[in-house]
Every structure is written in C-alpha cells, then in structure tokens.
C-alpha cells in the first residue's frame, strides 16, 4: 500500500526566522530505520534542504551544519528549520522513506507553505 504523509498546509516563521511543523506518516510496515528529508519546491525546482536517518525509538540527528533539527515520536516527526529569511518563503515538502527492513516504502507530503517575514530594523533611539 502507499504510505500517507501528513503535514500542515501553512506555517508562519517566527521573527527570528524559525519555523516548526509536524510531519506524520502512516507506516504500512514495521520499519526500524527511517529517513526523513525536507525538500523545498521553488517554481518547478525541488532541492534538498536537510535529511536525517533514525532508528525507531531513537532521536533523529541531522548533520552538525544542518539548518534543521527535529525530534521523533512513533510515526511523528517534529521538524524545525532555522535561519530562514524572506527569500526562503516557499513550499517545504516532507519526504519519508522506510529503509529497513525491506520492503522500502516512500511517502511524500503535499508540502507546507512557510512564510518568512524579515523583521523591521529597530529605529535608532535618542536618549
């Protein structure tokens, strides 16, 4: 069966350029190794933002230089993307792969539109 992946339609990043959303998948099998990838779709181009592989029951770990962090709980992954600016506004797609044991399963969410608004610079204050 096809694996369903759910994620929110829209998220607004904080003034500090941080956006968080939940990616939830309905696992057709009993996977012990899962890979989660965040993709960004801009126009017709899809690029990888970050990826992490984790063992079920363990925390997922992104690379040290990744702009993503996350926690996992069962079939749910809480993803946080940081360092976002207005130009990063776009559709962020959650891709889930059940890697082990075979068979492999792929699930791709419909995407979360993340809106990022750059903060206004603070005006100079006279004291």
């Amino acid at each position: 069966k096809a694996m369903h992946v759910a994620q929110p339609a829209v998220v607004l990043a904080s003034s500090r350029g941080i956006a968080s959303f939940v990616c939830e998948y309905a696992s057709p099998g009993k996977a012990t190794e899962v890979r989660v990838t965040v993709l960004r779709q801009a126009d017709s181009q899809v690029t990888e933002v970050c990826a992490a592989t984790y063992m079920m029951g363990n925390e997922l770990t992104f690379l040290d230089d990744s702009i993503c962090t996350g926690t996992s709980s069962g079939n749910q992954v809480n993803l946080t993307i940081q360092g976002l600016r207005a130009m990063d506004t776009g559709l962020y797609i959650c891709k889930v792969e059940l890697m082990y044991p075979p068979p492999y399963y792929l699930g791709i969410g419909n995407g979360t539109q993340i809106y990022v608004i750059d903060p206004e610079p603070c005006p100079d204050s006279d004291f």
Epitope: A2, M3, V46, E48, T53
Partner: antibody
Framework: QVQLVESGGGVVQPGRSLRLSCAAS????????IHWVRQAPGKGLEWVAA????????YYADSVKDRFTISRDNSKNTLYLQMNSLRVEDTAVYYC???????????WGQGTMVTVSS | DIQMTQSPSSLSASVGDRVTITCRAS??????LAWYQQKPGKVPKLLIY???TLQSGVPSRFSGSGSGTDFTLTISSLQPEDVATYYC?????????FGQGTKVEIK
Amino acid sequence: QVQLVESGGGVVQPGRSLRLSCAASGFTFSNYGIHWVRQAPGKGLEWVAAIWYDGNNKYYADSVKDRFTISRDNSKNTLYLQMNSLRVEDTAVYYCARNGVLGAFDIWGQGTMVTVSS
Amino acid sequence: DIQMTQSPSSLSASVGDRVTITCRASQGISNYLAWYQQKPGKVPKLLIYAASTLQSGVPSRFSGSGSGTDFTLTISSLQPEDVATYYCQKYNSSPWTFGQGTKVEIK
C-alpha cells in the same frame, strides 16, 4: 552535466561472473539512491536492484536475489553490480538510473550489454 | 508484489491524433507513478512523475492523470518524433515495477 556511464559488459558463459560499473558525475552522488534496470533483447524494462545513500540499504528483484550484489563507493562516485552464477536469461542491456528526489528515475546511463551464452 | 498492467500493448495512429495509454496497478499506489519514453535504440527518458507532473523539458502535448489504481498517459497531438515504447512504473515501494510497455507507431 549530470550523467551516468556504465561499463563492464561483455560475453560470458553460463555460471560465470561479471562486474558492471556505473560512474556518476555532475551531482552529489551520496545524496541519491541508484538502481540497476535491465532490458532483454526486444523486451521491456525490468528493475534489478537498488542501493541507497551510504550503501547500507540494498534491495533486489527476486530473479537476481542471492546471485547479484549491488554496491557503491561514494568516494569514487561509482556504483557496481557483481553478477554471479549468470544464466542465459540474464542476457540484457543493463542500465543504471538515479532515483530522483521525488522518487522517479530521472537520469539514466547509456547502458552496457551483457550476453550470457555457451 | 504489485503488478502493473498497460494497455494496449501496441497502437498505430496518425500524426495529429490524440493517443491514450492506460496503466493499472493491482493495488492502490496513490500517485506514485511515472511514465517513461524509450525511442528505438535509445535510453529510457522520464516524461511524467507523481502521475501528472511533467518532467522539465517535456513537451506540453504529453499529460498524465489518475490516482490509486488507474492511470492514463495522453499525447494530445501525436508527432512523428513520438514513435517510441512507453512504460509506466510504480515507485511507492520496492520492488520498483514497470508495466510491459506500449509501442506507439505512426499510421
């Protein structure tokens, strides 16, 4: 540019072995799963094997399980297919193909011909 | 394992005709379906993924539709360069199965 180039095909006798290679260039090899797909003369496409990212996860078609081994060397941007106990029915053009970020096979090599004949 | 069945196995149509090829999965695969074109003596080429999304550079006369078990590839106006064999493929899980192919010729 993005490309895959296969090599190592040839004529072998049944029961013998052969190793195919697929050299990748123009993209970050370790970020992609790569497949072997074959096509017997005048026939359709048949998926053979796949290997993911760091090489720890491998998948095989039932027709080649326990005879073929897929592997990769990310430092050399190269994919391999070790084919043992070859059979006449393994005669085909063997293609390597990249698993695109959204799941379909978006880049294919030019293929290498393997003929198993006595 | 999920089986992929294409129909027809071959067809002949005139230039400018609308051509439709169908692909049926033995179980639901959502929209995890791709279509490939293989011209005689050439390498397969990705045309459509996610059942209906056109791969970059593919002419707009090609379109795909369907979800679940039934899918369609349509060529709105057949051109001489479209002579090829077309394959559907499911990619939601291993094994990555192809349909048996549909050979398209010009009358």
